[in-house]
């Protein structure tokens, strides 16, 4: 008789793929020129990066470092009216992409959260929620909540409205704070939270850290849901060598939780690589006209166009990876399990239950390795086969869909592979 | 069960103000959100603004803003609406209404639990 069928885990819509951050709609959609209605067009790109959910804004109006000044339930009038808000969230439902509005109140501040009136704010906030989630919102991000004073009670207040508006709405929160301690002291108290941080980013970026950071968060963090980002809002260029990026991608895709971008993550956009552009939000480079002020400062391959057309490119990467992130269940809600291998390398297995299993192999070094794989540390459930077939690698020359033998596998520097072998009885 | 009073309407000139008030009776409205709304002859019922628990935070439409003001005073159990600078366009019923499961009313008139019966305000130009 075949064996019984695991039963699947309750999954909210965040587990099933990753949020796409836009801190700065204007930026986003080139120079000066953005709005929610312009917003509304670029969906399509959105959607053709399999994003789950949109962090949108803050878009509420906030005179800097005035609380009388500063309306949570008013959208700036620089960003568009209520009315459009309205019409981005009917169209984002239809193409069924959520939408998180960010609700950190002094964004445009010194304190993003008036360190003198935090009561009088918090009680803002609290109204700001059920009003926007009347509005349809999907859920909320506050961010430096280190600068909360009282942050856990606050935050345990805030996802009691949000989840007793209904369980599917979301509460992210983001802190600076790359400590361990305080991370999981903020999550403590609210069972839902996703909080994005700057753990990760605190790092030497070997295999060996790597590892022992992913280890110890999740150890932590027992079984909750967790997010995986390097920062609460920057860009992943903005705290990677560029060598790893796609490394990165590759780890944060296939990790178990919901991973975390920010627009231009998918292209490499850099901070501030431009002459002139503000460092945390840079223009987005739709194309080569996306940076009027200096001709021939942007090539084709740093943009969403030049990259959409090359198989090659980090944008068909995230693709691809955001591809079996969403709809692979060993990735979606699968067993994690790491596995010794060579030095400089982080190895690691998803599965779940008869579906068909993921190997991941990160080669963080600078030298070519051989991957000796050793499967001795892993239980019995997540035994390796001899064989798996390439799902992708992270860089170029390899044919994907290839059975490589994992005895002999090698890595090239600075390379992540993905494999993939049935589950076998 | 909450009863809704509306008071202080009337017949005033363009550009002139009027305040209308909400008593609450029945319960106190201190948790409750609470909306102003307007119905002019023949059309529909349109959200005007409303005003969060406390009182910290208030919303209005486009057309009222900047003009009409609403505030509540929840030791006397009852809800405001300061209107300025009016115009023969604001010409309506006007009703308070209570949101009973939200801190926050919103803009919907479905949300509302609560009713008054109404004032008349009719603004000659």
């Known amino acids: 008789r075949a064996p019984r069928c695991r039963e699947l885990p309750a999954q909210k819509w965040w587990h099933t793929g990753a949020l796409y951050r836009i801190g700065d709609l204007q930026a986003f959609q080139g120079h000066g020129s953005g709005n929610l209605a312009g917003l509304k067009g670029r969906l399509d790109y959105l959607s053709s990066l399999k994003v789950k959910g949109l962090v949108l804004g803050p878009l509420h109006k906030n005179q800097k470092d005035d609380v009388a000044q500063t309306d949570l339930l008013q959208i700036d009038p620089n960003f568009g009216s209520k009315e459009d808000f309205d019409n981005l969230l009917q169209s984002a439902k239809k193409k069924s992409i959520r939408v998180i509005l960010d609700l950190t109140p002094n964004y445009r501040g010194e304190n993003l959260w008036f360190s003198t009136q935090v009561d009088s704010v918090a009680t803002k906030v609290k109204d700001a929620l059920e009003f926007w989630l009347q509005a349809g919102v999907d859920g909320f991000q506050v961010r430096d909540i280190e600068n909360l004073k009282d942050a856990s009670s606050f935050l345990a207040e805030w996802e009691n409205i949000t989840k007793g508006f209904s369980e599917d709405r979301l509460l992210i929160a983001g802190t600076n704070s790359s400590d361990l301690q305080q991370i999981v002291s903020l999550l403590e108290s609210n069972k839902d939270l996703l909080l994005t941080s700057s753990y990760l980013s605190d790092s030497s970026f070997t295999g060996e850290h790597t590892k022992s950071l992913v280890t110890q968060y999740l150890n932590a963090t027992g079984n909750r849901w967790c997010s995986w980002s390097l920062s609460q809002a920057g860009l992943l260029t903005s705290f990677l060598p560029a060598q790893l990026l796609r490394l990165y991608q590759l780890m944060l895709f296939t990790l178990p939780g919901t991973p975390v971008f920010s627009y231009g993550d998918e292209i490499g956009l850099k901070a501030a690589a431009l002459p002139g552009q503000p460092v945390e939000a840079p223009v987005m480079l739709w194309d080569e006209s996306s940076f009027p002020d200096i001709p021939g400062a942007v090539s084709a391959n740093m943009t969403v166009k030049g990259q959409s057309e090359d198989p090659g490119s980090l944008l068909s990467l995230f693709r691809q990876l955001s591809d079996q992130r969403s709809k692979e269940r060993s990735l979606l809600h699968g067993d994690f399990h790491t596995f010794s291998s060579g030095p400089g390398l982080f190895s690691y297995i998803r599965h779940w239950d008869q579906n068909e299993r993921f190997l991941v192999v990160l080669n963080f070094g600078d030298v070519g390795l051989s991957a000796g794989l050793q499967a001795s540390d892993l239980p019995a459930s997540a035994s390796l086969p001899t064989k798996a077939d390439l799902v992708l690698s992270t860089q170029p020359g390899r044919e994907e869909g290839s059975p490589l033998e994992l005895e002999r596998l090698k890595l090239e520097p600075h390379e992540g592979l993905l494999l993939r072998f049935p589950y076998v009885a | 069960q909450v009863h809704l009073v509306e008071s202080g309407g009337g017949l005033v000139q363009a550009g002139g103000s009027l305040r209308l008030s909400c008593a609450a009776s029945?319960?106190?409205?201190?948790?409750?959100?609470m909306g102003w709304f307007r119905q002019a002859p023949g059309k529909e019922r349109e959200f005007v603004g409303t005003?969060?628990?406390?009182?910290?935070?208030?919303y209005y439409t486009d057309s009222v803003k900047g003009r009409f003001t609403i505030s509540r005073d929840n030791a006397k159990n009852t809800v405001y609406l300061e209107m300025n600078s009016l115009k023969p366009e604001d010409t309506a019923v006007y009703f308070c209404?209570?949101?009973?499961?939200?801190?926050?009313?919103?803009?919907?008139?479905?949300?509302?639990?609560?009713w008054g019966q109404g004032t008349q305000v009719t603004v000659s130009s």
């Open positions: 029945g319960r106190t409205i201190s948790t409750y959100g």
């Open positions: 209404a209570a949101d009973t499961r939200h801190c926050m009313g919103y803009t919907k008139h479905g949300g509302y639990d609560y």
């Open positions: 005003i969060s628990c406390s009182g910290t935070s208030t």
